[in-house]
Amino acid sequence: HSTLPEAPAGPPVGVKVTLIEDDTALVSWKPPDGPETVVTRYTILYASRKAWIAGEWQVLHREGAITMALLENLVAGNVYIVKISASNEVGEGPFSNSVELAVLPKETSESNQRPK
């Protein structure tokens, strides 16, 4: 018998955020662990800490199976919070733990990333 499709049971794993330009970061991740669940879209929520506290985050969708995305137009001097979920036609799975990225002023632009 065929099993009914299910929404992803877990979040994307191994989320990493790396500053690749002064105002652009690369987010990468791996598909959710567990049984083979089809993922047709990843949703990235991100915002500066200040905006996040105010509930004002950006929503970025990545259709398909590519597990990378660019976060563009970031503002130096802010710490950004990023989390990701996987979804398919059935529904959306849980969000990953938040990862933080410090976008430092140009003269000290080493990226600082740590799981929250």
Epitope: Q58, V59, L60, H61, A69, L70
Partner: nanobody, 120 residues
């Protein structure tokens, strides 16, 4: 359905040139900025640059000014990357990227990539 299809990659000798194309469909290409990125085998992704839609002005990532030129032809819905004086370290898969707003949300689309191999 949004589609980005890169072409123009292949094998080129050091010092040679290539022009990559990215044909866009499924959205109003002329309304949005576009980016090129690349990823060499086993290396982190690099941001090559971005081109504005209104002015057509490109902005380049660190290390990509001079040998690389980004342009676009809105009448053909096509983005270009001209690469000159190619070196072995330019060997990578090159992707075009568009980020298209839909209300308050954004949809980001990547092409399938085109492989450039610089070798003698």
């Amino acid at each position: 359905e949004v589609q980005l299809v890169e072409s123009g990659g292949g094998l080129v000798q050091p010092g040679g040139s290539l022009r990559l194309s990215c044909a866009a469909s499924g959205f109003t290409f002329s309304n949005y900025g576009m980016s090129w990125v690349r990823q060499a085998p086993g290396q982190r992704l690099e941001w090559i640059g971005w081109i504005d839609t209104k002015t057509g002005n490109p902005r380049y990532g660190q290390g990509f000014t001079g040998r690389f030129t980004i342009s676009r032809d809105n009448s053909k819905n096509t983005l270009y990357l001209q690469m000159n004086s190619l070196r072995a370290e330019d060997t990578a898969t090159y992707y075009c990227v568009s980020t298209v707003p839909n209300g308050v949300e954004y949809f980001q689309h990547w092409g399938q990539g085109t492989l450039v191999t610089v070798s003698s």
